[in-house]
Amino acid sequence: DAGVIQSPRHEVTEMGQEVTLRCKPISGHNSLFWYRQTMMRGLELLIYFNNNVPIDDSGMPEDRFSAKMPNASFSTLKIQPSEPRDSAVYFCASSL
């Protein structure tokens, strides 16, 4: 099994631009999670999906952030417009 696959591995953008992060969960997993990690704020759960349905997006109250899971094998996290403080490592995870 390839595990969870994210793209891109690295992203550099200008302030104000749109950023889209992509995730392919492990096949057969029905829950998907997006996290953000920074030195200042630690690890934050942004949103999670169960059976492609968003269950809790309270970790991203700014409407610059949006996430979709159109099918069981693909999810996107979009930031529009991006800000310098969005610089972070973004993790996607999946579980049964």
Epitope: R41, G42, L45, S58, G59, E62, D63, R64
Partner: antibody, heavy 117, light 106 residues
């Protein structure tokens, strides 16, 4: 029926502390982010702080950072706001509100905080 | 911080009038949210994501706009609509409200 009930307000001297509480019922509290908003007498609304469902994401108004601390206890269905080093300008009605529809879809009735010597 | 400026700050109108309140943002926002507040009461959500009516809100209320300028329109004022209205942005923290528009009976 969604209900939010604030408590803990009162009269406090400048430099003092208060802890506000917001008791939630009628919905699954642990699934929702929560806000604090305040309104000084005769003035408009001012956003204070936000906390996500599991407390991993927290935001504050810039002017309040370091003096106010938001927290929640999902086992007690309660939201808190710890307010330290209070000033006269913190005098206001403090509301808790549930995050829903991307906004604040349910509000409590408010609790009054008066900072005066 | 993104400053929201509402205009007018005060508005006198009569029952049956069509009223429009404008909310201008100092920086572009994705959406605007509108609240109604009556004296001594908590605010009530009216419109979310710029144009969606909150549950139970009458269809005479509508919202529109994009970028830096948004509007709340009441197509035919009813006696219960006389209140203060606030816009808010959630595009970027810290979240900010407009200063309010007080709608009074003429």
């Amino acid at each position: 029926e969604v209900q939010l009930v604030e408590s803990g307000g009162g009269l406090v001297q400048p430099g003092g502390s208060l802890r506000l509480s917001c008791a939630a019922s009628g919905f699954t509290f642990s699934n929702f982010g929560m806000h604090w908003v305040r309104q000084a007498p005769g003035k408009g609304l001012e956003w204070v702080s936000y906390i996500s469902s599991g407390s991993s994401t927290i935001y504050y108004a810039d002017t309040l950072k370091g003096r106010f601390t938001i927290s929640r206890d999902n086992s007690k269905n309660t939201l808190y706001l710890q307010m330290n080093s209070l000033r006269a300008e913190d005098t206001a009605v403090y509301y808790c509100a549930r995050r829903g529809e991307g906004a604040m879809d349910y509000w409590g009735q408010g609790t009054t905080v008066t900072v005066s010597s | 911080d993104n400053q929201l400026t509402q205009s007018p700050s005060f508005l006198s109108a009569s029952v049956g009038d069509r009223v429009t309140i404008t909310c201008r943002a100092s920086s572009s926002v994705n959406y605007i949210y509108w609240y109604q507040q009556k004296p001594g009461k908590a605010p009530k959500l009216l419109i979310y994501y710029t144009s969606n009516l909150a549950p139970g809100v009458p269809s005479r209320f509508s919202g529109s706009g994009s970028g830096n300028e948004y509007t709340l329109t009441i197509s035919s004022l009813q006696p219960e609509d006389f209140a203060t209205y606030y816009c808010e942005q959630f595009t970027s923290s810290p979240f900010t409200f407009g200063q309010g528009t007080k709608l009074e009976i003429k």
